[in-house]
Amino acid sequence: MSVTACQGLGFVVSLIGFAGIIAATCMDQWSTQDLYNNPVTAVFNYQGLWRSCVRESSGFTECRGYFTLLGLPAMLQAVRALMIVGIVLGVIGILVSIFALKCIRIGSMDDSAKAKMTLTSGILFIISGISAIIGVSVFANMLVTNFWMSTANMYSGMGGMGGMVQTVQTRYTFGAALFVGWVAGGLTLIGGVMMCIACRGLTPDDSNFKAVSYHASGQNVAYRPGGFKASTGFGSNTRNKKIYDGGARTEDDEQSHPTKYDYV
């Protein structure tokens, strides 16, 4: 796969993943009332990071925001924080990666700068994806713990004590937002990895030039007053000048063929 394709695909995959992270964060169905093996209610409860909702059999749905910060469980606060971190890093990653895309020309930005930006955006996407995955996983773990605790309470005879009125404990299970979050985090992570891989293809391979004295042979390279710096293609303002007229080459080839020069 060419560097441009890898970078472009990485960007698109990260973008989809990022959109998914935002969607998951905003969704109300992080946890939904467990309907299996439970007294069936005419009311369906579900909860998100920001509000809890109740849908009645009548179709009437009512949502209430969590209007307190101090009264909320620390784990919920942590999940919120992780998802917001994921979104913020994703936004920065997208902005950086737009400028880093090989197919977009911005001023006189050379490939080494684009490579650095691609790597930066890739790392940002990776951290964003991991942050979202951790956030969703922490919430899922919290649900599993609470689920088994309420199951234990249900069957430990709490409601069956002589003469006492039974109360039903609502159990919650995984909501759609968890699956959206896991997939979205995974896509953002994969997109970030692809950006990092693309960065390697964009990076000029300096090792081929270190401690090597070379001269351009007369028939290969036209004379430029700027000397070899101009003719090697690494000059700040000569990237797009056609230096060598020896057949069709891609921009990728331009960076990866130091053999166009005669080594001494």
Partner: antibody
Framework: EVRLQQSGPELVKPGASVKIPCKAS????????MDWVKQSHGKSLEWIGE????????IYNQKFKGKATLTVDKSSSTAYMELRSLTSEDTAVYYC???????????WGQGTLVTVSS | DIVMTQSPSSLTVTAGEKVTMSCKSS????????????LTWYQQKPGQPPKLLIY???TRESGVPDRFTGSGSGTDFTLTISSVQAEDLAVYYC?????????FGAGTKLEIK
């Protein structure tokens, strides 16, 4: 104005079946579930079941499973309840009722008296 | 199934009197999600279908006189008529609107002297 119009009284023989219609008007039929309630003479109310007119999904009281079948005809905005294998125990007034906030029933049909007698 | 127990089964009062009737459920009808109690009160006059009075245990249906008040939470609920009128002669039913199957109480018959 919301209206639920039920048919007149029915006299049926034991073992037979009867299908009671409930025609809704004054609101969008598919937006609200329709419930059915039984009231035997001088007795309390018994919930039979509920149907979602949008998708035909039903929830039945276990006691009436096999006895009552709830259906809808969206084109005519009519809900139906079919009662089969009728016995004298099934003699009662049957109401259709439209669900409302709090899963309560704000709108009721006038009731259909089903008398099972040979 | 949830059992709804109403008391008294009947009561006779004079016009203008205050009346309270009770309804107890075998399980809590309080939904933790919205902190609402899924209990409804109906009034049924002879030869008529039931009429909705109160839903969510305490929310009065529009058009219902304000002398009717619903209260209670969890398993114990009360319907209060602050000043009984002659037209209040009816049977009053409470209903569990939380658990399937939805269940009704046996009713409280209100008679006027």
């Amino acid at each position: 104005e919301v209206r639920l119009q039920q048919s007149g009284p029915e006299l049926v023989k034991p073992g037979a079946s009867v299908k009671i219609p409930c025609k809704a008007s004054g609101y969008k039929f598919t937006d609200y579930n329709m419930d059915w309630v039984k009231q035997s003479h001088g007795k309390s109310l018994e919930w039979i079941g509920e149907i979602n007119p949008n998708n035909g999904g039903t929830i039945y009281n276990q006691k009436f499973k096999g006895k009552a079948t709830l259906t809808v005809d969206k084109s005519s905005s009519t809900a139906y309840m079919e009662l089969r294998s009728l016995t004298s125990e099934d003699t009662a007034v049957y109401y259709c009722a439209r669900i409302y906030y709090g899963n309560s029933f704000a709108y009721w049909g006038q009731g259909t008296l089903v008398t099972v007698s040979s | 199934d949830i059992v709804m127990t109403q008391s008294p089964s009947s009561l006779t009062v004079t016009a203008g009197e205050k009346v309270t009737m009770s309804c107890k459920s075998s399980q809590s009808l309080l939904n933790s999600g919205n902190l609402k109690n899924y209990l409804t009160w109906y009034q049924q006059k002879p030869g008529q279908p039931p009429k909705l009075l109160i839903y969510w245990a305490s929310t009065r249906e529009s058009g219902v006189p304000d002398r009717f008040t619903g209260s209670g939470s969890g398993t114990d609920f009360t319907l209060t008529i602050s000043s009984v009128q002659a037209e209040d002669l009816a049977v009053y039913y409470c209903q569990n609107d939380y658990f399937y199957p939805l269940t009704f109480g046996a009713g409280t018959k209100l008679e006027i002297k």
